[in-house]
Amino acid sequence: MMTGTIETTGNISAEKGGSIILQCHLSSTTAQVTQVNWEQQDQLLAICNADLGWHISPSFKDRVAPGPGLGLTLQSLTVNDTGEYFCIYHTYPDGTYTGRIFLEVLESSVAEHGARFQIP
């Protein structure tokens, strides 16, 4: 039975040219996390494997910094980065948990960060 829940940064906005941290947290389960995948729609951004470390997709290679933690920092944002992002936690023995973040990249300088990542 899958008891875990994914908490995410939720809906966030950032300014064009800036950077943003995509962050998820798996709670309420003792399952072992073996890998975390970060995807944008159906495109793979990065993989963090417990044994092999990080792999960054070539198309994002120059502007992704792994971390903080299992999160992902996306730099040099463009309006094309607007959209849905998914953190996919592969765990044993529970299976797969998925969290969703929506990022809006704004042209103006009035972009405000949405819900900050905090565990209540």
Epitope: I56, R63, G69
Partner: antibody, heavy 118, light 106 residues
């Protein structure tokens, strides 16, 4: 087993720069963040920043962004940190440490001692 | 930035005594990591992801906590446990450490 070997102690003049190295072995260097940490008796452990050798992207603590420069050479599995415009406050032991799964620093170098003389 | 406050700063314990030290975060974090450092050596990862023991760490050590409150416990103090213990978070940038708890043998 991962292992981090740091360069030897440095005695440098005030105002000069110093560049130290951290040679990694026992793992795929380009797949893990390399963090740098400063330790002084008065300040404890302070995070300087990190580099992801796979793409060279760096992130710095605000305090050190104009003081330290992080680089990495994947061909030799070596990370470097240069500290510029040295003052007595830069006298410390500097550690490199590998970023493990989940954000803990799982392997540490033995440290490089930097002494700034006037 | 997230400030980590460790208490006590210094403590002493007799062999066989139970020891608990705490780490309080200024904002909620998802995990806490702990390091042991002995004089003249580099820190060693000791407890990670709040409660997992690093390889080679004796089972008398344990970690627990959530949100803003975390702790490291030694069920029965031994002489070799004398060291300074640091907590660390990387929930957000910058990564931060606590100031450390120095544990001495009484």
């Amino acid at each position: 087993q991962a292992y981090l070997q740091q360069s030897g102690a440095e005695l440098v003049r005030s105002g000069a720069s110093v560049k130290m190295s951290c040679k990694a072995s026992g793992y795929t260097f380009s797949n893990y963040n390399m963090h740098w940490v400063k330790q002084t008796p008065g300040q404890g452990l302070e995070w300087i920043g990190y580099i992801f050798p796979g793409n060279g992207v760096t992130t710095y603590s605000q305090k050190f962004k104009d003081k330290a420069t992080l680089t990495a050479d994947t061909s030799s599995s070596t990370a470097y940190m240069q500290i510029s415009s040295l003052t007595s406050e830069d006298s410390a032991v500097y550690f490199c440490a590998r970023g493990g799964f989940g954000g803990a620093l799982d392997y540490w170098g033995q440290g490089t001692s930097v002494t700034v003389s006037s | 930035q997230i400030v980590l406050t460790q208490s006590p700063e210094i403590m002493s314990a007799s062999p066989g005594e139970k020891v608990t030290m705490t780490c309080s975060a200024s904002s909620s974090v998802s995990h806490m990591h702990w390091y042991q450092q002995k004089s003249g050596t580099s820190p060693k990862r000791w407890i990670y992801d709040t409660s997992k023991l690093a390889s080679g760490v004796p089972a008398r050590f344990s970690g627990s906590g959530s949100g803003t409150s975390y702790s490291l416990t030694i069920s029965s103090m031994e002489a070799e446990d004398s060291a300074t213990f640091y907590c660390q978070q990387w929930n957000n940038n910058p990564l931060t450490f606590g100031a450390g708890t120095k544990l001495e043998l009484k």
